[in-house]
């Protein structure tokens, strides 16, 4: 017996209760590929997430993070708090970079200043919490 489900396009599911006819996905659900036996629940962008792309019958919703947060993980699976430049996020919140380190972004960790002397160069511009040192000529 031919499997009629393979004829069901994206946006539908193969309804075994209706002799394998293709039924439309219910509201707030989708199927991105043909031949599916069920639809998938749409992702809901709530809390620190905001909707970047609405769910449709053929594709899931896509989320971004609200202002003050940035995405982490595949498909923005998590939102992490932004810090100011010159800071890094710790378990206790945003903390200033220690002397000798910098962070020029609102995310990520503080990194050590470049050691100019390793390349036989001198420091042309001193580093700050927000900026790396600038090495001058040797």
């Amino acid at each position: 017996l031919q499997d009629l489900c393979s004829n069901c396009p994206a946006g539908t599911f193969c309804d075994n209760n209706r002799s394998q006819i293709c039924s439309p996905c219910p509201p707030n659900s989708f199927s991105s590929a043909g031949g599916q036996r069920t639809c998938d629940i749409c992702r809901q962008c709530k809390g620190v997430f905001k909707t970047r792309k609405e769910c449709s019958s053929t594709s899931n919703a896509e989320c971004d993070c609200i202002s003050g947060y940035h995405c982490l993980g595949a498909e923005c699976s998590m939102c992490e708090q932004d810090c100011k430049q010159g800071q890094e996020l710790t378990k206790k919140g945003c903390k200033d970079c220690c002397f000798g380190t910098f962070n020029d972004q609102k995310r990520g960790i503080c990194r050590p200043w470049t050691n100019c002397s390793l390349d036989g160069k001198s420091v042309l511009v001193n580093g700050t919490k927000e900026r790396d040192v600038v090495c001058g000529p040797s």
Epitope: F13, D15, N17, S23, C25, P26, P27, N28, S29, R37, T38, C39, D40, I41
Partner: nanobody, 122 residues
């Protein structure tokens, strides 16, 4: 056993109104996501309207927004679809539907009734 019994269809002129009813048994309308699908002659099923999130939100197809209103009477365990400003393209068999959420995240729906015919014609 889940049963859905639709009524209220009929022949109506363009611009007219109808109210469809769906008497449910075997489950509680107020505790489920429920709605209406329709099948026009020679066409596939189409979602018309639904009450979602246990009543927290409603869905309307673009083609019926502002003309159709979905509601329910918890005491009577009945779902309604108030249809106004009806058009020829609303002609279809209307089915009451219960959205089913499966373990593992899948979503389908059940239509157990025979449906009710709505014909919009002058």
């Amino acid at each position: 056993e889940v049963q859905l019994l639709e009524s209220g269809g009929g022949l109506v002129q363009p611009g007219g109104s109808l109210r469809l009813s769906c008497a449910a048994s075997g489950f509680t309308v107020s505790a489920e996501d429920v709605g209406w699908v329709r099948q026009a002659p020679g066409k596939g099923l189409e979602w018309v309207s639904a009450i979602l999130d246990k009543g927290g939100s409603t869905y309307y197809a673009e083609s019926v927004k502002g003309r159709f209103t979905i509601s329910r009477d918890n005491a009577k365990n009945t779902l309604y679809l108030q249809m106004s400003s009806l058009r020829a393209e609303d002609t279809a068999v209307y089915y009451c539907a219960r959205i089913v959420y499966h373990a593992g995240g899948g979503v389908t729906f059940d239509t157990r009734g025979q449906g009710t015919q709505v014909t919009v014609s002058s």
